[in-house]
C-alpha cells in the first residue's frame, strides 16, 4: 500500500501495543468492562479501607482541594484514515487511591454522549498506588458520518474531567452535495450548471464533461458553475469531482433544446349536436417547453370554394373543446394545433365531423280554432311551417292547450303526426278560456311555439274564436 495507507494501519495499532499509561507492573492483568456496563467496578482489594471506585464518605471541600489534580493522559490528537477502514483509539487516566469516589468513563462525540451500539471497552489496571483506567473505542469500517471530535468524560470526586479531543478524519472519494440538473434551454441561449462535491480530503476539483468530452482543461475548485454560452442540439453534461483519493462522476444530465411542439394526434369527435361538436385530442411532444394553448381550426367541408376557416383558441389542458355556433346538419373539417413558448405546432391531420339536424326555426302558421258544440270538441287547423333542410325531417306537431275558468287551471299537450294539418281535442271545461299554441317537431327537436290563440268556451252557448297570430300572407284575422 501507499505510505498514507501504511500509516493508517500501523500507527493506529500502536495505540494498543505501546506501553500502558502510568506506573503499572508488566505482570498486572487488567479488569475489563464493556461499554454497556461502563460503571462496573473491579472487585475490592484487601487491605484498603476504601477501594477505588467504591462509594465512600464525602470528602470535605477543603480536603478535596488538597488532592493532587487528576487528568486524562495525552493521546493521539488526529487520526486520518480512508473510508471502510477499521479504527481504534483510547483515552486513559490514572486515579490515585486518595480519590474516594469515581464514576465510569463515558465516550462523547461532537458534544453528544455515545450510547448503545458503539464498541467500547474499559480496562482497569489496579496497583498499590491506585488504578489506571483505559477506555478503548473502535469503529469497524468507518464512514463519513464517523468524522468528528471524540473525547472521554469521567467524574472524580464529583468533578467532571474531560479528555483532549481525538479528531477522526475519514477520507474518501468526493461526495456530491449538488449535482447538475437537467434543463431545457432555448437554442443559442446561455445557461448555467452547478456542481459541488466535498471531501475529505480537500481540495475537491471539478472537471466538466459534455458528450463524453472534458470541457475544461484546468480543474475548478468545488463548487463549480459552468456557463454554457448556448447549444444548438441536445447535449449530455456531467461533472467529475477529483480529490487525492480518486474521482467520482455525477449523473449525466440531458440539456434539451426547446423546439416547437409536434402536432396533436388522435383528434376525435366525442359528441355532436345540431350546433356544436365536442372534440378531443392527444397533445404531441411538447418540444421541451410546456404547451401554453391550442387552436381548433374548423372549415365547412361542403363548400366548393375555399371556405373561411374558423379558429377557436383554448387552454392547452384539458385536451377537449366544444366548438359552438355551428350550422345544423352540416359537415366540417377539424384540425388542432398547439403552441409552446417557441411557437405553434403544425396542425394535426384534418378529420371530418357532422352536426346533427336542428329543431325547426319557425312555428306553424295560420292557426285557427273552432268549437264543434255538437261533438263537444275543438277543431284546430294550421299550415305547415317552411322547414329548411338543416331543420331536419318533420315528424309531427305538439299542441299545447291551457284551460282557465274561475278557480280552475288545466295545462295539457298533445303530439300529432305530421300527416295533415289539423287536430281535434275534447272540450275540457265549459265557461272557460282555452289558449292554444302549436310547435313543429323534427328529429332535431321541437321548434318554437306559435303565438297563442284564445277561444272562449261558453256554457253551451255561442262560440267566439280567434285565428292564429301568424297568418299566412294575405289572410285576415277573422274567418
Amino acid at each position: 500500500g501507499g505510505t498514507a495507507e501504511k500509516w493508517e494501519e500501523t500507527e493506529l495499532d500502536q495505540l494498543f501495543s505501546g506501553p500502558l499509561p502510568g506506573r503499572l507492573p508488566v505482570n498486572h492483568r487488567p479488569f475489563s468492562a464493556p461499554h454497556s456496563s461502563r460503571d462496573q467496578l473491579p472487585p475490592p482489594q484487601t487491605g484498603r479501607s476504601h477501594p477505588a471506585h467504591t462509594a465512600a464518605p464525602q470528602v470535605t471541600s477543603t480536603a478535596s482541594k488538597l488532592l493532587p489534580p487528576v487528568a486524562f493522559n495525552h493521546t493521539i490528537g488526529h487520526i486520518v484514515l480512508s473510508e471502510h477502514k477499521n479504527v481504534k483509539f483510547n483515552c486513559s487516566i490514572n486515579i490515585p487511591n486518595t480519590y474516594q469516589e469515581t464514576a465510569g468513563i463515558s465516550w462523547w462525540k461532537d458534544g453528544k454522549e455515545l450510547l448503545g451500539a458503539h464498541h467500547s471497552i474499559t480496562q482497569f489496571y489496579p496497583d498499590e498506588e491506585g488504578v489506571s483506567i483505559i477506555a478503548l473505542f473502535s469503529i469497524a469500517s468507518v464512514q463519513r458520518s464517523d468524522n468528528g471530535s471524540y473525547f472521554c468524560k469521567m467524574k472524580v470526586n464529583n468533578r467532571e474531567i474531560v479528555s483532549d479531543p481525538i479528531y477522526v478524519e475519514v477520507q474518501g472519494l468526493p461526495y456530491f452535495i449538488k449535482q447538475p440538473e437537467s434543463v431545457n434551454v432555448t437554442r443559442n441561449t446561455a445557461f448555467n450548471l452547478t456542481c459541488q462535491a466535498v471531501g475529505p480530503p480537500e481540495p475537491v476539483n471539478i472537471f466538466w464533461v459534455q458528450n463524453s468530452s472534458r470541457v475544461n482543461e484546468k480543474p475548478e475548485r468545488s463548487p463549480s458553475v459552468l456557463t454554457v454560452p448556448g447549444l444548438t442540439e441536445t447535449a449530455v453534461f456531467s461533472c467529475e469531482a477529483h480529490n487525492d483519493k480518486g474521482l467520482t462522476v455525477s449523473k449525466g444530465v440531458h440539456i434539451n433544446i426547446k423546439v416547437i411542439p409536434s402536432p396533436p394526434t388522435e383528434v376525435h369527435i366525442l359528441n355532436s349536436t345540431a350546433h356544436s361538436i365536442l372534440v378531443s385530442w392527444v397533445p404531441g411532444f411538447d418540444g421541451y417547453s410546456p404547451l401554453q394553448n391550442c387552436s381548433i381550426q374548423v372549415k365547412e367541408a361542403d363548400r366548393l370554394s375555399n371556405g373561411s376557416v374558423m379558429v377557436f383558441n383554448t387552454s392547452a389542458s384539458p385536451h377537449l373543446y366544444e366548438i359552438q355556433q355551428l350550422q345544423a346538419l352540416a359537415n366540417y373539417s377539424i384540425a388542432v394545433s398547439c403552441r409552446n413558448e417557441i411557437g405553434w405546432s403544425a396542425v394535426s391531420p384534418w378529420i371530418l365531423a357532422s352536426t346533427t339536424e336542428g329543431a325547426p326555426s319557425v312555428a306553424p302558421l295560420n292557426i285557427t280554432v273552432f268549437l264543434n258544440e255538437s261533438n263537444n270538441i275543438l277543431d284546430i287547423r294550421w299550415t305547415k311551417p317552411p322547414i329548411k333542410r338543416q331543420d331536419g325531417e318533420l315528424v309531427g306537431y305538439r299542441i299545447s292547450h291551457v284551460w282557465e275558468s274561475a278557480g280552475t287551471y288545466k295545462e295539457l299537450s298533445e303530439e300529432v303526426s305530421q300527416n295533415g294539418s289539423w287536430a281535434q281535442i275534447p272540450v275540457q271545461i265549459h265557461n272557460a278560456t282555452c289558449t292554444v299554441r302549436i310547435a313543429a317537431i323534427t328529429k332535431g327537436g321541437i321548434g318554437p311555439f306559435s303565438e297563442p290563440v284564445n277561444i272562449i268556451i261558453p256554457e253551451h252557448s255561442k262560440v267566439d274564436y280567434a285565428p292564429s297570430s301568424t297568418p299566412a300572407p294575405g289572410n285576415t284575422d277573422s274567418m
Epitope: P203, N205, V209, K218, P219, R221, E240, D244, G246, L247
Partner: antibody, heavy 114, light 109 residues
Framework: QVQLKESGPGLVAPSQSLSITCTVS????????ISWVRQPPGKGLEWLGV???????DYNSALKSRLTISKDTSKNQVFLKMNSLQTDDTARYYC????????WGTGTTVTVSS | QAVVTQESALTTSPGETVTLTCRSS?????????ANWVQEKPDHLFTGLIG???SRAPGIPARFSGSLIGDKAALTITGAQTEDEAIYFC?????????FGGGTKLTVL
C-alpha cells in the same frame, strides 16, 4: 494552457542519485496531483509515483526505497529524487497530470553510465 | 503487482473502426481503475486521450471513445485516420499506483 517541463542532469554515474524538476505552468499544484513516469529506451512506460495536492505521496512499491517526490507549491515545481542509480535506470523521465494522464511534459533523458 | 495486458499490434484501414483492449491480471477492469489511454507519437510526444471516467481530454476528436467491454477496458477509434498511427498505452489505477500496459502499435494502412 497547462504545461509541464522537466529538467534533469542528463548523465548520472552508477550508485549516484538523480534529481529532476518538473515546472508546472497554467495551473496551481494545489489543484493538480502530479505523477512521474519513465520509459527505458525501446520499452514501455513505468509509473514511478505521485505527489498529491495535499503533499502526500504514493510510490511504485518496487522503487519505493529509492524514491522521494516533493514539491514547492509557491514555485509550482515538483521534484523527483532517486538514489542508488543503476544502468537499468537509464530512461526518459516524464511528469504528467495524475488522474488524467493527458498533460505530459516532453521528458528529460537520463543516462546512467560511468 | 498487477499486470496489464494489451494487444501488441493492430492494423486497420482509414475509415474503419478499430478497438484496442486492456486487461488486468487481477480480474475485471472496473470504473475504480480509472482506465487511461495515452497515445505516443514519434519524438516522445505523449497525449492523454481518455481518462478518469472514460471522458475525452479537451481537444481530442470524438472518434476516440473509451468504455468497459466485458471485463476489459477498451479504446475505440471510429473512422480511423492515417494520423492515428501511433503506440497506445493503457494505464489502470490500483488503489494507490498506476500500472501501464505494454502498449499497442496501431498501423493505419
Amino acid at each position: 494552457q497547462v504545461q509541464l517541463k522537466e529538467s534533469g542532469p542528463g548523465l548520472v554515474a552508477p550508485s549516484q542519485s538523480l534529481s529532476i524538476t518538473c515546472t508546472v505552468s497554467g495551473i496551481s499544484l494545489s489543484s493538480f496531483a502530479i505523477s512521474w513516469v519513465r520509459q527505458p529506451p525501446g520499452k514501455g512506460l513505468e509509473w514511478l509515483g505521485v505527489i498529491w495536492t495535499g503533499g502526500g505521496t504514493d510510490y511504485n512499491s518496487a522503487l519505493k526505497s529509492r524514491l522521494t517526490i516533493s514539491k514547492d507549491t509557491s514555485k509550482n515545481q515538483v521534484f523527483l529524487k532517486m538514489n542508488s542509480l543503476q544502468t537499468d535506470d537509464t530512461a526518459r523521465y516524464y511528469c504528467a497530470s495524475h488522474w488524467y494522464l493527458d498533460v505530459w511534459g516532453t521528458g528529460t533523458t537520463v543516462t546512467v553510465s560511468s | 503487482q498487477a499486470v496489464v495486458t494489451q494487444e501488441s499490434a493492430l492494423t486497420t484501414s482509414p475509415g474503419e473502426t478499430v478497438t484496442l483492449t486492456c486487461r488486468s491480471s487481477t480480474g475485471a477492469v472496473s470504473t475504480s481503475n480509472y482506465a487511461n489511454w495515452v497515445q505516443e507519437k514519434p519524438d516522445h510526444l505523449f497525449t492523454g486521450l481518455i481518462g478518469g471516467a472514460n471522458s475525452r481530454a479537451p481537444g481530442i476528436p470524438a472518434r476516440f471513445s473509451g468504455s468497459l467491454i466485458g471485463d476489459k477496458a477498451a479504446l475505440t477509434i471510429t473512422g480511423a485516420q492515417t494520423e492515428d498511427e501511433a503506440i497506445y498505452f493503457c494505464a489502470l489505477w490500483f488503489s494507490n499506483h498506476w500500472v501501464f500496459g505494454g502498449g499497442t502499435k496501431l498501423t493505419v494502412l
